[in-house]
Interface confidence: low
């Protein structure tokens, strides 16, 4: 199923014609130099592929819409009723270049297609590549693919969120969390239970891929030596090894902490202790107060010693409904003594306090290195009863279909030019003939991209 057996758009036969440049004529010095005009031609794989689809025939043929329902959701939102269409990008600069578009917002979408033949993880690498354009930006949603495990139960018209997959790969975003997933499901050789293993997050800032409304090319390369690379627009953004760079790790640790071990009561974790030989100096007065009255202070002139600070409000009247039995004896509310307003103060004058120069506080011996320090206690290690060692995690469960099972709060996510292959050269050719044209048409081609494309065409006329 390469998707190019009908309605092929044969606009030109050769990339020398596709990139139409007037090489001989000198540009008019009064006019700005024009961009090369790019004409679209549907890409064709240059070798054997497990799957390829450019959607340029304009139909969903070969793709199966899911009729499943999510089993853990209310009925009205459980159905996979999100719409898919094959159409050109809204702002397309390449007439005839169609893609698969997720049309609806706030709905579950699921669509899948069978591979030409199952991919068996053996001696050849796996390369998965496709394009995504968030035409309306993206608020919260995914654009990742699932490579669906080859099982007797696999039924594509019942494809749903619990359908077993071997690999999940691609962009995903919610809020300000921008992700590029690479997850594979590893089978525990001891228990037979599958566990998701997630690649470490890329160091690169992924935000622009989601926000710039350009078409980006996502590539996953998985090698039989367990190494992997993730590329965006043909540049590596993440790489590693299935044995060392997945979370949780593929292989559990050989040893674990003894669950029964406990810290001995006399285990000493104190790095420092009070010096047992230190002696409190004879002149250390622990009872001296921190503050003392300032003996040099004098009472301000005009201080009214006999006037209280507060007096009963002379205008206050006992409320008519005051009940002495229930409310007690009525007392007029207090107000600031009006006589004190013009004086420096009223009432009994007290000396202000100052820091006591002789205050030393409670004596503490100085700290010294603890001669009995045993370090931070850790439980002893014991052999992990659940230990196993799988040194070839690349040998994953074979997969026989590709699926998109997505929820998005933003519509019009454009997918294009899916390819699954074991040959990097074929995938690179496909990228040049598809994404490369988009890039050139966008006028975003770096210097030399057009030249590279012409060279590529000359290599395989």
């Amino acid at each position: 199923h390469d998707g190019h057996d009908d309605d092929v758009i044969d606009i030109e036969d050769d990339l020398d014609d596709v990139i139409e440049e007037v090489e001989d004529s000198k540009p008019d010095t009064t006019a700005p130099p024009s961009s090369p005009k790019v004409t679209y031609k549907a890409p064709v794989p240059t070798g054997e592929v497990y799957f390829a689809d450019s959607f340029d025939r304009g139909t969903l043929s070969g793709w199966i819409l899911s009729k499943a329902k999510k089993d853990d959701t209310d009925d009205e939102i459980a159905k996979y009723d999100g719409k898919w269409e094959v159409e050109e990008m809204k702002e397309s600069k390449l007439p005839g270049d169609k893609g698969l578009v997720l049309m609806s917002r706030a709905k579950h979408h699921a669509i899948s297609a069978k591979l030409n033949k199952p991919f068996l993880f053996d001696t050849k690498p796996l390369i998965v590549q496709y394009e995504v354009n968030f035409q309306n930006g993206i608020e919260c949603g995914g654009a990742y693919v699932k490579l669906l495990s080859k099982t007797p139960e696999l039924n594509l018209d019942q494809f749903h969120d619990k359908t077993p997959y071997t690999i999940m790969f691609g962009p995903d975003k919610c809020g300000e969390d921008y992700k590029l997933h690479f997850i594979f499901r590893h089978k525990n050789p001891k228990t037979g239970i599958y566990e998701e293993k997630h690649a470490k997050r890329p160091d690169a800032d992924l935000k622009t891929y989601f926000t710039d409304k350009k078409t980006h090319l996502y590539t996953l390369i998985l090698n039989p030596d367990n190494s992997f690379e993730i590329l965006v627009d043909q540049s590596v953004v993440n790489s590693g090894n299935l044995l060392n760079d997945m979370t949780p790790p593929v292989n559990p640790s050989r040893e674990i902490e003894d669950p029964e071990d406990r810290k001995p009561e006399d285990w000493d974790e104190r790095p420092k202790i009070p010096d047992p030989e230190a002696v409190k100096p004879d002149d250390w007065d622990e009872d001296a107060p921190a503050k003392i009255p300032d003996e040099e202070a004098t009472k301000p002139e005009g201080w009214l010693d006999d006037e209280p600070e507060y007096v009963p409000d002379p205008d206050a009247e006992k409320p008519e409904d005051w009940d002495e039995d229930m409310d007690g004896e009525w007392e007029a509310p207090q107000i600031a003594n009006p006589r004190c307003e013009s004086a420096p103060g009223c009432g009994v004058w007290q000396r202000p306090v100052i820091d006591n120069p002789n205050y030393k506080g409670k004596w503490k011996p100085p700290m010294i290195d603890n001669p009995s320090y045993q370090g931070i206690w850790k439980p002893r290690k014991i052999p992990n009863p659940d230990f196993f060692e799988d040194l070839e995690p690349f040998r994953m469960t074979p997969f026989s279909a590709i699926g998109l099972e997505l929820w998005s709060m933003t519509s019009d996510i454009f997918f294009d030019n899916f390819i699954i292959c074991a040959d990097r050269r074929i995938v690179d050719d496909w990228a040049n003939d598809g994404w490369g044209l988009k890039k050139a048409a966008d006028g975003a081609a770096e210097p030399g991209v057009v030249g590279q494309m012409i060279e590529a065409a000359e290599e395989r006329p």
Epitope: E257, P259, D261, R262, K263, P379, R380, I382, P383, P385
Partner: antibody, heavy 116, light 112 residues
Framework: EVQLVESGGGVVQPGRSLRLSCAAS????????MHWVRQAPGKGLEWVAV????????YYADSVKGRFTISRDNSKNTLYLQMNSLRAEDTAVYYC?????????WGQGTMVTVSS | DVVMTQSPLSLPVTLGQPASISCKSS???????????LNWFQQRPGQSPRRLIY???NRDSGVPDRFSGSGSGTDFTLEISRVEAEDVGVYYC?????????FGQGTKVEIK
Amino acid sequence: EVQLVESGGGVVQPGRSLRLSCAASGFTFSSYGMHWVRQAPGKGLEWVAVISYDGSNKYYADSVKGRFTISRDNSKNTLYLQMNSLRAEDTAVYYCARGGRAFDIWGQGTMVTVSS
Amino acid sequence: DVVMTQSPLSLPVTLGQPASISCKSSQSLVNSGGDTFLNWFQQRPGQSPRRLIYKVSNRDSGVPDRFSGSGSGTDFTLEISRVEAEDVGVYYCMQGTHWPRTFGQGTKVEIK
């Protein structure tokens, strides 16, 4: 006084469930690994399960794996044993014992009888 | 699993006489740190087990000094220097070095 008191035993039909508890007092419960050990009538002692002081690690005897679950609530100083899919051969007195490899403190035991 | 084998399984003794129980393990009980986790328990009739000896030879507090433990590697012994009436019951050895923890079958001590 350091003490462990088990409860929750009783008579139950095969295939049914039962939950045992073990209340600890007189020591810092949250510092100790805790075990369940059982003794079938007239037989010897059989280790059943262990849980680490903070509950993060648990191990089980093969004879109960997948059916029994050990857990603890350190805020309540209590150890639990959830026993599902009970069989006649699970009939025994169940003891909880304080850890540290040496099983230095034991409860008085609670009898579980599995019978139709 | 480590198998713990006790002998004899029944031990009739005369009051005041010594008694000896053997316990053999199918693997060495010396752990990587050089410690040997072999414990002895006493279970009197109708009672819970009670620890007597830990780490081969260390007596628990409150345990009479007529009880002693010895041995190394895979061979261990519990000795009662002079048996008293209160010593009647079943004695178990238990290894705490390997998972799962395993007990011996028990030795029943009774008065002749």
